[in-house]
Interface confidence: medium
């Protein structure tokens, strides 16, 4: 999906309003120094591409993030403010429903969400002008 035509200001507002709290809740009890930030992004569409990938693409050691509250809100936000996004996700959602996995918060998942927090911050910093 090409995120170029999203309403970035509205996505930023949704992040500040609700998604950030869910990410903080998920990461509660860990420190940023526990993980190395290895994922970055260079502009707004690129940040959203990386955010989508880390949030919704299962990895061998972290398969369940898409069911977390922050992921559900991220999906709703992208569907709301990125034209045509929801249509591109229908097949992916149906495929996910067939692979029901036990919900486990592994260290790998915590590392992945730590990366997400960094990507969201980077997304916002590409929106804002230094005063």
């Amino acid at each position: 999906y090409d995120f170029t035509n999203c309403d970035f200001q509205k996505i930023e507002a949704d992040y500040l309003r609700t998604i950030s709290k869910d990410l903080i809740t998920y990461m509660s009890g860990t420190k940023s120094t526990d993980f190395n930030n290895t994922v970055s992004c260079s502009n707004r569409p690129h940040c959203l591409t990386e955010i989508q990938s880390l949030t919704f693409n299962p990895t061998p050691r972290c398969a369940s993030l898409a069911k977390e509250m922050f992921a559900r809100k991220t999906k709703a936000t992208l569907a709301l403010w990125c034209p045509g996004y929801s249509e591109t996700q229908i097949n992916a959602t149906q495929a996910m429903k067939k692979r029901r996995k036990r919900k486990v918060t592994t260290n790998k998942c915590l590392e992945q969400v730590s990366q997400l927090l960094g990507l969201w911050r980077r997304f916002i910093r590409t929106l804002l002008k230094k005063q």
């Epitope: 309003r17 420190k31 927090l117 005063q131």
Partner: nanobody
Amino acid sequence: EVQLVESGGGLVQPGGSLRLSCAASGFTFADYDYDIGWFRQAPGKEREGVSCISNRDGSTYYADSVKGRFTISRDNSKNTVYLQMNSLRPEDTAVYYCAVEIHCDDYGVENFDFDPWGQGTLVTVSS
């Protein structure tokens, strides 16, 4: 549960002072370098940014309407952020909220719509 609890509000005469506190529970301000800010909402008005503090380098930002009168500070050992309010005016009357993850080092204090994590604390400036 992740929560922010604001306290320290009350009734004060014009020219008086108050110190507001914002205490975090369920997470630690320092853990992810969370930026923290104070916002306020007066009856019938939109919420506005008052002040914020960067958790990375301690940089502070203030709305023009409070510069020179309000001071924001943090105590990571107590997981609390403070707003010292001096020379209070009737127009400072509002419910004051704190919020995290607002990147105050990038934009100073700007208005945005957020769901308050706490109940806020009411400040009334009146003679």
